[in-house]
Amino acid sequence: LKGQEFAPSHQQVYAPLRADGDKPRAHLTVVRQTPTQHFKNQFPALHWEHELGLAFTKNRMNYTNKFLLIPESGDYFIYSQVTFRGMTSECSEIRQAGRPNKPDSITVVITKVTDSYPEPTQLLMGTKSVCEVGSNWFQPIYLGAMFSLQEGDKLMVNVSDISLVDYTKEDKTFFGAFLL
Amino acid sequence: LKGQEFAPSHQQVYAPLRADGDKPRAHLTVVRQTPTQHFKNQFPALHWEHELGLAFTKNRMNYTNKFLLIPESGDYFIYSQVTFRGMTSECSEIRQAGRPNKPDSITVVITKVTDSYPEPTQLLMGTKSVCEVGSNWFQPIYLGAMFSLQEGDKLMVNVSDISLVDYTKEDKTFFGAFLL
Amino acid sequence: LKGQEFAPSHQQVYAPLRADGDKPRAHLTVVRQTPTQHFKNQFPALHWEHELGLAFTKNRMNYTNKFLLIPESGDYFIYSQVTFRGMTSECSEIRQAGRPNKPDSITVVITKVTDSYPEPTQLLMGTKSVCEVGSNWFQPIYLGAMFSLQEGDKLMVNVSDISLVDYTKEDKTFFGAFLL
């Protein structure tokens, strides 16, 4: 049989067929974060578990030093959830003191770094004001979308405040990507 | 033509090619929940609509008795949204009474059950403190990620309080999975 | 080699194999919205950037006049995030004034329109009461799920209040779909 017979009749096969099980994929899970230096105006990056428990990397998708390395150009679905938890936000304390009640916030950014380009690209951002009444609060921010990435691109997850990230359970805070 | 010509030149075809339309897939939608017994420390599982409206199961992915049955080993993207709604949480009542204001919470867990292993595995958790000022509140929790599953695994969605789940619309509360 | 050797032995290849890079895909990003007329009881639709920055459409998936056009029948993963921001909701003002504290809300709906039928079908809804204490609030609603779509179907994103949508950054508010 000619290969053409596998393809829908209305189109040319202009990209190679490939086995789905061979595509680059990763699901990373949270670990306790070690305080690290970061630039004043740049959110710190999380580091991740890549092989224990539910975490894995496969088919040349590698994790190193807070980055997921993209081994092959193509369209990827990228996702992350970060669960934050804290004590009463300053917002309500400020409010009680009669000062202007600017809310605190929590933010997650999925960032792409390309070696040939100095400035990181923000792919996805989830940001939320936190102005809780209760003394202890917790909540997740979930992000996910599709992006065209190039071989050699690096992905990371940045957060507004690393000390608020819930690192207690692998199902609460995670980061993943897979080639479509 | 040799089959090799369908594969990218840099790799071996070590998994079979397969038609995408043939992959196990399911999207389940909410139904009114019937109160059921559940263990004291275990969140109750939701049951689902699997064939009316927007719901479907296909290609040997079956739904039975609150579980999605995984028919084939591989990497699956699994997702769920649960919309919760309720009256003012106890948190604000407690606060008004001057007692320590421990917040209420809402939680969704996507759980994997493997027959050969007694303990369920929590794959994804979304949990949020609820300390609302308004008398009626409502909000969704969304989860989604990729996991390596084995043939015979079963997936379910558990919630912290089944009575708070909004079952009024199929687009508000749902659960799905598809083989990548 | 016979084509059959590419397929798992337990199944017939009843759908054509096709190159993944050839599948319809789109990721649209937010632009400043121009006020438009909409029916009283229908949420307004957002319009989108489809080719600048992170936005793209490919493989016959086209964007036109607020709609993503589905070029081919099949199962699609559809997603959107809308970030809302506003001043203190009326809810807390009402509360201070001692009137019944009905919460405001923010809602995102992903809607399918079929030419042969005037009534849209709501595929996904994320809805949240907003009853914030702080003077400025902001938060995202994320949605994503899989649906069977027909060639010619059109997708749009509707929101409860277009003036609350954060259009300042392409990573905060977006809409996408891809054929599985």
């Epitope: - | 939608t29 139904v31 009114r32 019937t34 064939e51 009316l52 719901a55 079952y167 619309k169 | 079908t121």
Partner: antibody, heavy 124, light 107 residues
């Protein structure tokens, strides 16, 4: 407006097959299931089966299992019911009906739109 | 399969009278029960869905009640056009099934 239009009357010999069509208009065909119901002369309604144009799922009445096949063509918005190995007691008016579903976990709806009926006569 | 039993088989009443039709299921169908009206030579018409919800365009004199195994269709004051055969149908589990029908005839 919402309507279902069925194919015309059929006269068949025992052992033959019949295929009745039901063309939908005025609504999103893929979203709502289609049931087929028959009514023998002077008898009550008998539910034959259901198909979802959205996902292809089918359910058939036990007594017709193996003899009936329901299909849909979403491109022409048409549902089909084929009954094989016809017998004289299959003589009936055959109806297609839209299964309304309100998109709510609280409701199952009902058959809210019916075709005009197709008379099938099985006689040697 | 779930068996639905309707009673009475025939109900003879005059216009203006109240009609009460019963439908009993062999096992619980929750509230997933519909009622249909059929006149000679016509297709059936949906009256009530989910036990108690009137379908679009159905007059207020038609009402449904019940849940579990016992259901009632009530016509508060019979109009001449209401004389017909009424069927209940369960939609709780496959296969859907109909009752055998109740004929409401003019006395």
């Amino acid at each position: 407006q919402v309507q279902l239009v069925q194919s015309g009357a059929e006269v068949k010999k025992p052992g033959a097959s019949v295929k009745v069509s039901c063309k939908a208009s005025g609504y999103d065909f893929t979203y709502y299931g289609i049931s087929w119901v028959r009514q023998a002369p002077g008898q009550g309604l008998e539910w034959m089966g259901w198909i979802s144009p959205y996902n292809g799922n089918t359910h058939y009445a036990q007594k017709l299992q193996g003899r009936v096949t329901m299909t849909t063509d979403t491109s022409t918005r048409t549902a089909y019911m084929e009954l094989r190995s016809l017998r004289s007691d299959d003589t009936a008016v055959y109806y297609c009906a839209r299964e309304n579903y309100y998109g709510s976990g609280a409701y199952r709806g009902g058959m809210d739109v019916w075709g005009q009926g197709t008379t099938v006569t099985v006689s040697s | 399969e779930i068996v639905l039993t309707q009673s009475p088989a025939t109900l003879s009443l005059s216009p203006g009278e109240r009609a009460t039709l019963s439908c009993r299921a062999s096992q619980s169908v929750s509230s997933y029960l519909a009622w249909y009206q059929q006149k000679p030579g016509q297709a059936p018409r949906l009256l009530i869905y989910d036990a108690s919800n009137r379908a679009t365009g159905i007059p207020a004199r038609f009402s449904g009640s019940g849940s579990g195994t016992d259901f009632t269709l009530t016509i508060s004051s019979l109009e001449p056009e209401d004389f017909a055969v009424y069927y209940c149908q369960q939609r709780s589990s496959w296969p859907w099934t109909f009752g055998q029908g109740t004929k409401v005839e003019i006395k």
